[in-house]
């Protein structure tokens, strides 16, 4: 038999199907050009010493074989006695280690069947009613094509499916979509009504997202606040990847899932934005305000389930770092500056109440005055602050305050608010004899003791009212009793006691009279 | 290891008040935020309140004002006080731990260490 043709004699080797479940597969045969056809086809196991032959059978029952050797790709005209008009069913044999492997039959008309391509370049993704619909540009001149998917997941193999016929410029399938794995398809075409015509090779590989992106599983930690007045968080635990099929792995675009930090900062409600989503890679610095922190999983199908945080405000307090001055204007307050063109944001709020009650107040950029402080003023009429109780200020500043991630804290402290030195006057004051010259003086706490730092001392004042002498003690802010001593038997006496805070002296208290009885000997 | 056994649930009048304990054993138990969520049958669990290591707290809305949360680090507990319940607070309630700096989640997912639970039913 010359090579060129199908030899009608029996082939070289015993007809015996060994039936191993290697072999040669996927066979697919097509017209070329006007006289020439293609066979090719896959052979899966060890290819050394391996024969094949494409066997060839006519509706006459005449059979033939073309030998191929080691190649897996054959070419013949339509003069190789093949006939290409009528139908034919053909196969490959192949030899190997004294056994015959077989390929499943196809059963074609040779010169009606056109090598159809798989879909190329893009394959468009998306879900329509809870299904996976891909779409993709029809090859050129392939308009009419029945197609097929398979699809695997990390765990499972792959599973055939129908896409129907399609007979327009855009092809299309709809697919199934799992919820919680991400998948592999490949897409194949074969020309339509063309009975028994090859598949074309399968496609890239397409890889699909689950249908609900992982619930990201971090955890954080916030550093303590640094001189510069900001706190690191830090990511302790990244999100745990999405498992793979095997030909996503590597580079498998579409499968990626995006985890972005969304940061709230509760504290400073005035300033112009409180909300800033952050790449997860990308750790910010924060003030020592109240955040709520969520991480937010996201694939191309949307976002997925929140992981959420709440960051406390870091209530570490400078007592010293602030001064104020109340004046018959106003009260106007002062701390170190930070740097040139600031925008600092005060918040206060009534100690013990709720965080949803701080009222903040936004100064315009200022750079420090000569003395290297910043200042910020109000008036009596504003109401800020004026109510005669414990208020607790936090000072933020900022370069950018619409950058959210660039504040930071310029001081933490308590402020007793109103008028300071009235309020703070101790009551209830009492005085009960201790021995033969002294007494013991008892007041009830000052209000300004409910305010951590702001109360300096007591001051006891003690007058002789026959001598007019005036004698004072000072007395730690934790103490609300003292002895006086020294004190003479049938003498009047007033005491009174002061609240003084930092910068600001107290007002007495109502004056207490006493005097210790002369003692008369029996 | 942290194993976490809460007790202190039961049937109160709407109104009333129940103080929660949560015993923690097998770790470092000042090194890690505390948390208390609750859940009803069939609906996701939801976060009560927190309390980071250094006693900074967090209360969700629903529960801001009436729930205190506090703990004592000597004796490794943790404490939700309950007071002027609801019929909307029966639920059963879970202690939770998470080995974290100064960072209370507020979602299920973000703790580590669960608690078996202890169920409270308040009655209308």
């Known amino acids: 038999c010359r090579t060129s043709e199908c030899c009608f004699q029996d082939p070289p080797y015993p007809d015996a199907d060994s039936g191993s479940a290697s072999g040669p597969r996927d066979l697919r045969c097509y017209r070329i050009s006007s006289d020439r056809y293609e066979c090719s086809w896959q052979y899966e196991g060890p290819t050394a010493g391996v024969s094949h032959f494409l066997r060839c059978c006519l509706s006459s029952g005449r059979c033939c074989y073309f030998a191929a050797g080691s190649a897996t790709r054959l070419q013949f005209s339509d003069q190789a006695g093949v006939s290409v008009l009528y139908t034919v069913t053909l196969w490959v044999e192949s030899w190997a280690r004294n056994q015959t492997e077989k390929s499943p039959e196809v059963t074609l008309q040779l010169y009606n069947s056109v090598k159809y391509e798989p879909p190329l370049g893009d394959i468009k993704v998306s879900k329509l009613a809870g299904q996976l619909r891909m779409e993709w540009e029809t090859p050129d001149n392939q308009v009419g094509a029945e197609v097929q998917f398979r699809h695997r997941t990390p765990s499972s193999p792959w599973k055939l499916g129908d896409c129907g016929p399609q007979d327009d410029d855009t092809e299309s399938c709809l697919c199934p979509l799992e919820m919680n794995v991400a998948q592999e398809f490949q897409l194949r075409r074969r020309q339509l009504g063309s009975q028994g015509s090859s598949w074309s090779k399968w496609s890239s590989p397409v890889c699909v997202p689950p249908e609900n992106p992982p619930q990201p599983q971090v955890r954080f930690s916030v550093e303590q606040l640094g001189q510069d007045g900001r706190r690191r968080l830090t990511l302790k635990e990244q999100p745990t990847q999405l498992e793979l099929p095997e030909g996503c792995q590597g580079l498998a675009p579409g499968t990626e899932v995006t985890y972005r930090l969304q940061l709230h900062m509760l504290s400073c409600p005035c300033k112009a934005k409180a909300t800033r989503t952050l790449h997860l890679g990308k750790m910010p610095y924060l003030s020592g305000a109240a955040y709520n922190v969520a991480v937010i999983s996201s694939n191309q199908f949307g976002p997925g389930l929140n992981q959420t945080w709440h960051i406390p405000a870091d209530t570490h307090t400078e007592p010293v770092a602030l001064n104020i001055s109340v004046g018959t204007n106003g009260t106007t307050m002062y701390w170190p500056a930070r740097a040139q063109s600031m925008t600092y944001c005060i918040e206060w709020q009534p100690v013990g109440q709720d965080g949803g009650l701080a009222t903040c107040s936004l100064t315009a950029p200022q750079d420090p005055d000569p003395a290297g402080m910043a200042t910020y003023s109000w008036s009596r009429e504003s109401g800020a602050m004026g109510q005669e109780k414990c208020y607790y200020i936090t000072i933020f500043a900022s370069a950018h305050p619409e950058k959210l991630t660039l504040w930071s804290t310029v001081l933490s402290t308590y402020h007793f608010g109103g008028n300071a030195s009235a309020a703070g006057t101790p009551h209830h004051v009492s005085v009960k004899n201790h021995s033969l010259d002294s007494v013991s003086v008892d007041w009830a706490p000052s209000l300004l003791s409910t305010c951590p730092g702001v109360l300096k001392e007591y001051v006891v004042r003690c007058r002789d009212e026959d001598s007019k002498q005036v004698s004072e003690h000072p007395v730690q802010p934790t103490e609300t009793q003292v002895t006086l001593s020294g004190l003479r038997a049938g003498v009047a006496y007033t005491v009174q006691v002061r609240a003084d805070t930092a910068w600001l002296r107290g007002v007495w208290s109502q004056p207490q009279r006493f005097s210790i009885e002369v003692q008369v000997s029996d | 290891q942290v194993q976490l056994v809460e007790s202190g649930g039961g049937l109160v009048q709407a109104g009333g008040s129940l103080r929660l304990s949560c015993a923690a054993s097998g770790g470092p138990f000042s090194g890690y935020v505390m948390g208390w969520f609750r859940q009803v049958s069939g609906k996701e669990r939801e976060f009560v309140a927190g309390?980071?290591?250094?006693?900074?707290?967090y209360f969700a809305d629903s529960v801001k004002g009436r729930f205190t949360i506090s703990r004592d680090n000597a004796k490794n507990m943790v404490y939700l006080q309950m007071n002027s319940l609801k019929p909307e607070d029966t639920a059963v309630y879970y202690c939770?731990?998470?080995?974290?700096?100064?960072?209370?989640?507020?979602?299920?997912?973000?703790?580590?260490?669960w608690g078996k639970g202890t169920l409270v039913t308040v009655e209308p």
């Open positions: 939770a731990a998470v080995n974290s700096f100064g960072v209370i989640p507020t979602s299920p997912n973000g703790m580590d260490y």
């Open positions: 309390i980071t290591g250094i006693s900074s707290t």
